[in-house]
């Protein structure tokens, strides 16, 4: 990334689309939550991410090279009854017209008697909504995700079965003081009560009926983080996720 | 329903200062990035200062760095522009516009407040 | 920085005409061109965005074109309502530019 433009603007967590590239290691991350290299662990002789090209490149077809954005699927569709699906999706009731894949298996309304099937790990996910509101939103934020990822997702339960999502108060990073920036226009002192601007919640990845349709599903969280960091990196993400991680040994109460 | 009311505007002599606020209302106001935007008389648009309030990351054009600061508080989902050293050439319709695309600034202004007119003159 | 040059500067047209408007970029900017549409006293109206989408509640008649470096905005048959001050805008990088307007006037 020879841009001195670049260079200044890289980890102000703004994405600027000038900077948004491989070489400049998606404007530092700022395109990217956070993640500067998403196909780091991909082995392809192919640029992967140069091939985000709506048409099958087997050689990024791997979970390691993000499946090549799932563009090697013979029979990519569309949900027919999206609205009626996105209603009741994960509900408890099962629409048998809503259990596909492009319409997320009726969020597992049809394979509940089916065992489980884990991913390996934690997505840990930081987004702009404070909790009361996303947990209100859970079915619609999982299904989101779900689409994006090819498979189903489920927030994790602490080791009280308290679902782990957790109020999100920003972070007073290098990255945030990079231009002398604060949050609020009040002095350090009066910053004591905390204001909640999001939440950070803990994912799992439900394979079970992945497994049936599928030769693309992830087994750890891993590529699935960076995948929804490609997605952000295009522009896809339809709400406003602020970073992403994958944790494959995760502690269960961890804030 | 997604709206932006500026306020702040007024007359204000060369050298002067003024501090313009933009009230976001119907949205997420943290997610969204939010732009400065003036038209002086009779002439095209000009964009001023971008802010992302998640963050507090701050873009400016050059013709008004280091006399303009644009910052946000999130607990009142308001963005304010704070003018000093002002100039002649500072006088314009000010309007603040959300960005579509959350952490961008590269996404288009798809919600402008109503203007708040800015004078500067002696 | 980019700058953004729009042509013509003003037209003169009657309902029902099509209408062309181009923007030109001092350099690529891939897509990432807005056009905007502004009356007299009112603030400016997103029209269209990623140089061909239209926003929200934006009539079909307006259709927006190009990549890279050459852009247009068309209106295919103008309206009454359509007689407004039109502005392409760069959203590739910062400093964010304008284009300089293109006043469409009724014949």
């Known amino acids: 990334c020879q841009s001195q433009y670049c260079a200044d603007k890289a980890r102000d967590g703004i994405c600027d689309e000038a900077c948004n590239s491989h070489a400049c290691q998606w404007d530092g991350g700022d395109c990217s939550l956070t993640m500067e290299d998403p196909w780091a662990n991909c082995t392809s002789t192919l640029r992967c991410w140069e091939y985000i090209n709506n048409q099958c490149d087997e050689q990024c077809n791997t979970a390691e090279c993000l499946f090549d954005n799932f563009e090697c699927q013979r029979n990519s569709k569309t949900c027919k009854y999206d609205k009626y699906c996105a209603d009741h999706f994960k509900d408890n009731h099962c629409d048998q017209g809503c259990n596909s894949e492009e319409c997320g298996w009726d969020g597992l309304d049809c394979a509940s008697d089916q065992p489980e099937n884990l991913a390996e790990g934690t997505l840990i996910i930081v987004v702009l909504l404070p909790p009361e509101q996303l947990l209100q939103d859970s079915r619609s934020f999982l299904r989101a995700l779900g689409t994006l990822l090819h498979t189903n997702l489920r927030i994790k339960q602490d080791s009280q079965g308290a679902l782990m999502v957790y109020p999100y108060f920003g972070e007073k990073s290098a990255a945030m003081k990079k231009q002398k920036m604060t949050r609020r226009s009040l002095p350090e002192e009066q910053e004591q009560e905390q204001e909640v601007i999001g939440s950070k919640i803990f994912l799992e990845i439900d394979n079970r009926q992945c497994v049936q349709d599928s030769d693309q599903c992830f087994k750890n969280t891993d590529a699935a983080a960076a995948l929804l960091a490609s997605h952000a990196i295009q522009g896809t993400l339809s709400y406003p996720l602020v970073s992403v991680f994958s944790e494959l040994e995760s502690p269960r109460n961890a804030q | 329903e997604v709206q932006l009311v500026e306020s702040g505007g007024g007359l204000v002599q060369p050298g002067g200062s003024l501090r313009l606020s933009c009230a976001a209302s119907?949205?997420?106001?943290?997610?969204?990035?939010m732009s400065w935007v003036r038209q002086a008389p009779g002439k095209g648009l000009e964009w001023v200062s971008y802010i992302y309030p998640y963050s507090g990351a701050t873009y400016y054009a050059d013709s008004v760095k280091g006399r303009f600061t644009i910052s946000a508080d999130t607990s009142k989902n308001t963005a304010y522009l704070q003018m000093n050293s002002l100039r002649a050439e500072d006088t314009a319709v000010y309007y603040c516009?959300?960005?579509?695309?959350?952490?961008?600034?590269?996404?288009?202004?798809?919600?402008w407040g109503q203007g708040t007119l800015v004078t500067v003159s002696s | 920085d980019i700058q953004m040059t729009q042509s013509p500067s003003s037209l003169s047209a009657s309902v029902g005409d099509r209408v062309t408007i181009t923007c030109r970029a001092s350099?690529?900017?891939?897509?990432?061109l807005a056009w905007y549409q502004q009356k007299p006293g009112k603030a400016p109206k997103l029209l269209i965005y990623g140089a061909s989408s239209r926003a929200s509640g934006v009539p079909s008649r307006f259709s927006g074109s190009g990549s890279g470096t050459d852009f247009t905005l068309t209106i295919s048959s103008l309206q009454p309502e359509d007689f407004a001050t039109y502005y392409c805008?760069?959203?590739?990088?910062?400093?964010?530019?304008f284009g300089q307007g293109t006043k469409v006037e009724i014949k």
């Open positions: 119907g949205y997420s106001f943290t997610s969204y990035g």
């Open positions: 805008q760069q959203y590739y990088s910062s400093p964010l530019t």
């Open positions: 516009a959300r960005h579509s695309g959350y952490y961008r600034i590269s996404s288009a202004m798809d919600v």
């Open positions: 350099q690529s900017i891939s897509s990432y």
